[in-house]
Structure formats: structure tokens, C-alpha cells
Amino acid sequence: LIIGFGISGKHFITVTTFTSAGNIGEDGTLSCTFEPDIKLNGIVIQWLKEGIKGLVHEFKEGKDDLSQQHEMFRGRTAVFADQVVVGNASLRLKNVQLTDAGTYTCYIHTSKGKGNANLEYKTGAFSMPEINVDYNASSESLRCEAPRWFPQPTVAWASQVDQGANFSEVSNTSFELNSENVTMKVVSVLYNVTINNTYSCMIENDIAKATGDIKVTDSEVKRRSQLELLNSG
């Protein structure tokens, strides 16, 4: 969470940004809020990126002004125009790329004053893992797969029954580069598993952490997955 202040005459205006992460190959959002101003025509929003000449996006007098936009952002950016009056200056970024990572500045000018705040935007790839029982193996095994990760994550297994156990000796993890030569498919196999136990496959890099749980009993297989972004907020 980054809060910036500005002074215009006697007035401070608070601008707040949140460190956020973009999943490459999807649309992303760079979050920025400010003190609302009902006078839409008096609001100017400028997004800048460190090391880039020209603007990422500009919104003023109630509409986009892309005349100063840098070409790497052409056709890719939007503010949520209907939410500007309530203080939302967040930027939507189409088809996030690895090169979109960096430090951005959200600059706001309203009738109440000026302000700005920086935002660290991380880009990478993260996806939910899926765990299945690997019946092909000679012994009962679990196979944890996640289609897209970058940077290369760490993979760890855990068990509800054997809490604190180290499964590195009985698991094998591989990383296969995907066709676009950036992201990788993560596959981890855990050997010698026992039934009536819950196992967790945890995949983590500096952007996200994903966990897949599986419980195998005689009668059923229960699965659950979750994904959380790290260092946001």
C-alpha cells in the first residue's frame, strides 16, 4: 500500500496505490484511488511508467486523451470511466506482458488539488494446480500439475498425517517450457502415498502461491485448490 500526498494551494489530495501482479497473457489492473470529486471535467488522471517517455494513459475532461501515449501501450489501456467520479483511477491493461513490469506513477489533478503515488507492478504467470491419482505408477502416486508459472517456482508437498515431514526424497518435480518460451508447466509426482490421508502440493514464486489439496479414501477422491497473490496491498 502506497499513499501519496500533494499540495495545491492549501489542499492536500490523497492518492493510494496497491502493489499488484499481472498474469501474463491476461488482462491486468493497476490499482489507484483518490479523494472523489463530483466535477468529472476537472479530473485529470495520468499514468506514467519509469523509464518510458510519453504517457501510459491519460484521462481528462471526462474522456481519454491518448495523444501523448507511448506506443507500447497503444490499444491496451483503459480507465474505468464510470468510476472516476467516485475516486477510482485504476488502469486496465490488456494482454499483460513480461515487459510491463516496473514502477508506475498514478498522478491525479482535481479541483481539490494534486497528488500522486507510485506502484510496483510485477508480472509473471501463475495458475491453479490440479492433483490426480497416478494409477500408471508402480506404487500409489499423486501427480500435481499446473500449466503456467513464471518465474520458476518452488514445489513442496505436505501431508496432514505426517506434518512436518520432508517429501523431497519421495517426490520428483519437472518444469517444461511452454510454447511461447516464457512460462513453464509444472509437474510434480509424489510417490508411496497412503489412502485416508490429505496431501497438499504447494507451488510458490515471488508473485503467487498456489495450493492443491487431495484426500483419497476407499470410496472417493476430494480435491481443493486455491491461489493467492503475494506482496499485494
Partner: antibody, heavy 115, light 109 residues
Framework: EVQLVESGGGLIQPGGSLRLSCAAS????????MNWVRQAPGKGLEWVSV???????YYADSVKGRVTISRDNSKNTLYLQMNSLRAEDTAVYYC?????????WGQGTTVTVSS | EIVLTQSPGTLSLSPGERATLSCRAS???????LAWYQQKPGQAPRLLIY???SRATGIPDRFSGSGSGTDFTLTISRLEPEDFAVYYC??????????FGQGTKLEIK
């Protein structure tokens, strides 16, 4: 050269299924937003579906539940699986790459649904 | 869902004249996500303008785009014989989905 080539169209009976293919060359399908757009005879363009670089998919309401967009990264090919076909699905189907907009289009493949 | 309405439906002009095509959105559209396409009979559409005003690669400078919010315009400053075709505007929305206008047919007078 950047190119898209569709195939798989033809005459199909109502309720039938068809799989359209779109072979890409000169760029990587999995790095782009890839779309299917159709055009009924004498009508305008209608967006059908998109698959993001991440693999996430979206569909127009008119086809939701009846079509599936997918890709084979090893073949650099986009697909559209069409089921429960109706007469109103008769159209030329185009695949299109979206970078900053739909800048590369295939030549189209014709699907005719008729008994 | 955002609806794009193009006007006029048909525009009859002579070579050398100026053509002005309109695209109106039912709600505000980001300029970045507004594009224009040209389509000739029996051919696939061709991208002309993206980001409301940026010309695509290889597009002559007689084509220009402008507008923001809900009103966008495609202008062809001096019509050439090869410009007579159907023109579509298109937006990338927040659903996310894409929407095309119904098209404007530019015909020779």
C-alpha cells in the same frame, strides 16, 4: 510471413457437430488473444469466442454452452468445436489475432447448417 | 453489453470526396479499445484504425480516426476507387467481450 488459415467448414445437418481449425504461421498462437468471428450471409460481423494467452476462454451468449475454443500449442493451431448446430449458425467463420486490435485475419471457412 | 450503432447505414459518394462515418456506443468505451475495419466482398476484414486514432501498418494516411467516450468517427479525406467497401467499428469490452457495429456500406454515387 504472419498468416492464419482456417479449415473444417462444410455442410452439416441441424444438431450436428463440426470442428474448425485455424493454423497460424509467423507468430505464436499461445502468446496472443485469439478469436473466432463469424459472418452470416449478407450480414455483419459477430464475435464468437476468444482464448487468452493464459488459456482463459470467453464466449458470446449466442453460442455459450454449444461451442468450445481451444488450441494446440505444439501445432500452433486454434480450434472451434461446434455442437448442437442450428440454422442460424450458418456463416463464414474467421479466426483473428488480437494484439492491439484484430490485426491478422484468416480467409474464412464456410459452415452451412441445413437439412 | 455495449451496443455500437453505426451511421449512416449506406453512404453514397464519388471518388475524390470526403467520407465521414460515425460509430456511437451505448455507454462509454475506452479510446484504446476502439477499432475500425474495412471489408470488401468475398474478403476477410482488414484492420484500419486501432486505439480510436492510430493507423494500422500499411494503411494510407487518407484514413483517420477520432473521438472518445461514446462518439467515434472514421474519416477518409479523399476517396479512392478501392475505398468503396463496408466499414465496421469494434470495441473490446469489460465482460470481456468484443462488439461490432452493424456496418456502414460506402458505395459509389
Amino acid at each position: 510471413e504472419v498468416q492464419l488459415v482456417e479449415s473444417g467448414g462444410g455442410l452439416i445437418q441441424p444438431g450436428g457437430s463440426l470442428r474448425l481449425s485455424c493454423a497460424a504461421s509467423g507468430f505464436t498462437v499461445s502468446s496472443n488473444y485469439m478469436n473466432w468471428v463469424r459472418q452470416a450471409p449478407g450480414k455483419g460481423l459477430e464475435w464468437v469466442s476468444v482464448i487468452y494467452g493464459s488459456g482463459r476462454t470467453y464466449y458470446a451468449d449466442s453460442v455459450k454452452g454449444r461451442v468450445t475454443i481451444s488450441r494446440d500449442n505444439s501445432k500452433n493451431t486454434l480450434y472451434l468445436q461446434m455442437n448442437s448446430l442450428r440454422a442460424e449458425d450458418t456463416a463464414v467463420y474467421y479466426c483473428a489475432r488480437d494484439t492491439y486490435a484484430m490485426d491478422v485475419w484468416g480467409q474464412g471457412t464456410t459452415v452451412t447448417v441445413s437439412s | 453489453e455495449i451496443v455500437l450503432t453505426q451511421s449512416p447505414g449506406t453512404l453514397s459518394l464519388s471518388p475524390g470526396e470526403r467520407a465521414t462515418l460515425s460509430c456511437r456506443a451505448s455507454q462509454s468505451v475506452s479510446s484504446s479499445y476502439l477499432a475500425w475495419y474495412q471489408q470488401k466482398p468475398g474478403q476477410a476484414p482488414r484492420l484500419l484504425i486501432y486505439g480510436a486514432s492510430s493507423r494500422a501498418t500499411g494503411i494510407p494516411d487518407r484514413f483517420s480516426g477520432s473521438g472518445s467516450g461514446t462518439d467515434f468517427t472514421l474519416t477518409i479525406s479523399r476517396l479512392e476507387p478501392e475505398d468503396f467497401a463496408v466499414y465496421y467499428c469494434q470495441q473490446y469490452g469489460s465482460s470481456p467481450m468484443y462488439t461490432f457495429g452493424q456496418g456502414t456500406k460506402l458505395e459509389i454515387k
